[in-house]
């Protein structure tokens, strides 16, 4: 066959379903690969034509659209199951042609197994609540398109393995769930349950996420430096090793980059010849605070080296801070001979 | 469709146990719960507990708990209850019924299990 | 556990009456409230689930509501096919547990 325009296997979709629910996986041609949609394409003649590898096999089959009760269909740029079965599980192929034009991508599709309390293998999204800050609401997510609007489903949502019920701030409002405060003890996974009926079947949508509760805009501050401070003085003597930590406090801001870094004698230290190495941990607080230390270290210090100015520098969406450090060289202690000499008027 | 086929009647002297098979087939067994429901003659339903096969997952009610064991088998998609130190009053058809979440959307045909002396 | 009051026990009606079933719970419920039909001799069938969700294939003329403690079963216009016991059930605590059932007669 002529050749085909092969976008090879978009991993960037792996796309994870549960077994024995709904899916529809749209074409990812038209949503990342092609500047055109699938109507424009339809009425330019274009077909669009499925087919799949089975886990572990290498032999690409065409998709059979002739199960019991249309298990599996396509409508348009989607490929329905009505429901998943654990085999379903490979690489989907869909391919754009006419006589002069093709296109074509794969995907993978994992169909996985929930226990009792919807653990699973599946990748969960993540909601971001602010900690105390009035009403919050997650939406049951990617459930657009199961259902025509004049089909009511019922909604069941969980927390973990229990339905959600008589929780003191945490309110099923259909597709909705309201967090009238959120606090630390809402952190978890979420899952809410959307049951249709469809041709005299009953179907079930299945999608969990984590809720984790961070802090607040309220209380968002520029980034703080608890060191270098006043109160600490670095007094080294030459040959000896240089320590400096920097430690800075960011507040949680969704979205912010935080950054630290030093400056000597305003450049930055790869841009300098002395024999620098900095070291950076991070760590996090209940609410996603970030608490960032970087070590500077010269191992063997010059008095030079203790002449610099050596400036930690912070920034976050918040602002930017910075602060120097004390360095100086220790004044070598007096030898006690010589000064008793010298106090006797000794010659 | 989903179907779920039941073992025979059963006849069994106070004391002994009954084992109640329960086949599914048209859904997968795996993911749903399997829930255990009984009716005395000319009584209402009472529920005894379910399983959910995927992990094994059992809760009983406070009535039954230490007498009935529910078990499943993944390779032939078969769940069985089985109730022990029997009395007249087990006498009851004995039903499973299949529910992805809590409500029991299909059920078996039932299994009638009388135990006399 | 929760207890589940159902009435009445039994009434007869006419083909074409509006027929409606009562369900009180113990305490409330939250809406976690299914109706099953059973048919003599036969098993049960899940008709309404979650209090007022139509069961799929279940005919439209049956429907459900309620909140908290009270819930109601209701056929619109009553049909001979529909001769049965009704059988309420929460699902709210475990156990679950059922009202005593409501059997329907045709006059």
């Known amino acids: 066959s002529e050749r085909c325009d092969d976008w090879g296997l978009d991993t960037m979709r792996q796309i994870q379903v549960f077994e024995d629910e709904p899916a529809r996986i749209k074409c990812p041609l038209f949503e990342h690969f092609l500047k055109f949609n699938y109507s424009t394409a339809h009425s330019a003649g274009l077909t669009l034509i499925w087919y799949w590898t089975r886990q572990d096999r290498d032999l690409e089959e065409p998709i059979n659209f002739r199960l019991p009760e249309n298990r599996i269909s396509k409508e348009k740029d989607v490929l329905w199951f009505r429901p998943t079965l654990l085999n379903d599980t490979g690489n989907y192929t869909c391919m754009l042609r006419n006589t002069t034009y093709c296109s074509k991508v794969a995907f993978p599709l994992e169909v996985v197994q929930k226990d009792s309390c919807f653990n699973s293998p599946m990748k969960l999204p993540v909601h971001k609540l602010y900690i105390e800050y009035g009403i919050q609401r997650i939406t049951c997510p990617n459930v657009d398109g199961y259902f025509p609007s004049s089909v009511k489903p019922t909604i069941t949502w969980y927390m973990g393995c229990y339905k959600i019920q008589n929780f003191n701030n945490v309110i099923p409002e259909g597709m909705n769930l309201s967090f009238l405060i959120a606090l630390i003890s809402n952190n978890g996974n979420y899952t809410c349950v959307v049951t249709y009926p469809e041709n005299g079947r009953t179907f079930h949508l299945t999608r969990t996420l984590t809720v984790k509760v961070v802090g607040s805009p309220k209380n968002a501050v520029p980034p703080v430096i608890h060191s270098p401070n006043d109160h600490v003085v670095y007094e080294k003597e030459p040959g000896e090793e240089l320590l400096i930590p920097c430690t800075v406090y960011f507040s949680f801001l969704m979205d912010s980059r935080n950054e630290v870094w030093w400056t000597i004698d305003g450049k930055k230290p790869d841009d300098i010849t002395i024999d620098v190495t900095i070291n950076e941990s991070i760590s996090h607080s209940r609410t996603e605070d970030e608490t960032r230390t970087q070590i500077l270290s010269i191992k063997k210090v010059t008095s030079e080296d203790l002449k610099r100015s050596y400036v930690c520098h912070a920034r976050s969406a918040k602002g930017e801070v910075a602060k120097a450090a004390k360095v100086k060289q220790k004044v070598p202690a007096p030898r006690y001979t010589v000064e008793l000499a010298c106090g006797f008027g000794a010659t | 469709q989903v179907q779920l086929v039941q073992s025979g009647a059963e006849v069994k002297k106070p004391g002994s146990s009954v084992k109640v098979s329960c086949k599914a087939s048209g859904y997968a067994f795996t993911s749903s719960w399997m829930n255990w429901v009984r009716q005395a003659p000319g009584q209402g339903l009472e529920w005894m507990g379910r399983?959910?096969?995927?992990?094994?997952?059992?809760h009983y009610a406070q009535k039954f708990q230490g007498r009935v064991t529910l078990t499943a088998d993944k390779s032939t998609s078969t769940a069985y209850m089985e109730l022990s130190s029997l009395r007249s009053e087990d006498t009851a058809v004995y039903y499973c019924g299949e529910g992805y979440l809590d409500p029991m959307d299909y059920w078996g045909q039932g299994t009638l299990v009388t135990v006399s002396s | 556990d929760i207890q589940m009051t159902q009435s009445p026990s039994s009434l007869s009606a006419s083909v074409g009456d509006r027929v409606t079933i009562t369900c009180q719970a113990s305490?409330?419920?939250?809406?976690?409230l299914n109706w099953y039909q059973q048919k003599p001799g036969k098993a049960p069938k899940l008709l309404i689930h979650?209090?007022?969700g139509l069961h799929a294939g279940v005919p439209s003329r049956f429907s459900g509501s309620g909140s908290g403690t009270d819930y109601t079963l209701t056929i619109s216009s009553l049909e001979p096919e529909d001769v049965a016991t009704y059988y309420c059930?929460?699902?709210?605590?475990?156990?679950?547990?059922f009202g005593g059932g409501t059997k329907v007669e045709i006059k």
């Open positions: 979650y209090t007022s």
């Open positions: 399983i959910y096969p995927g992990d094994g997952n059992t």
């Open positions: 305490q409330g419920i939250n809406n976690y």
């Open positions: 059930q929460q699902y709210s605590i475990l156990p679950w547990t």
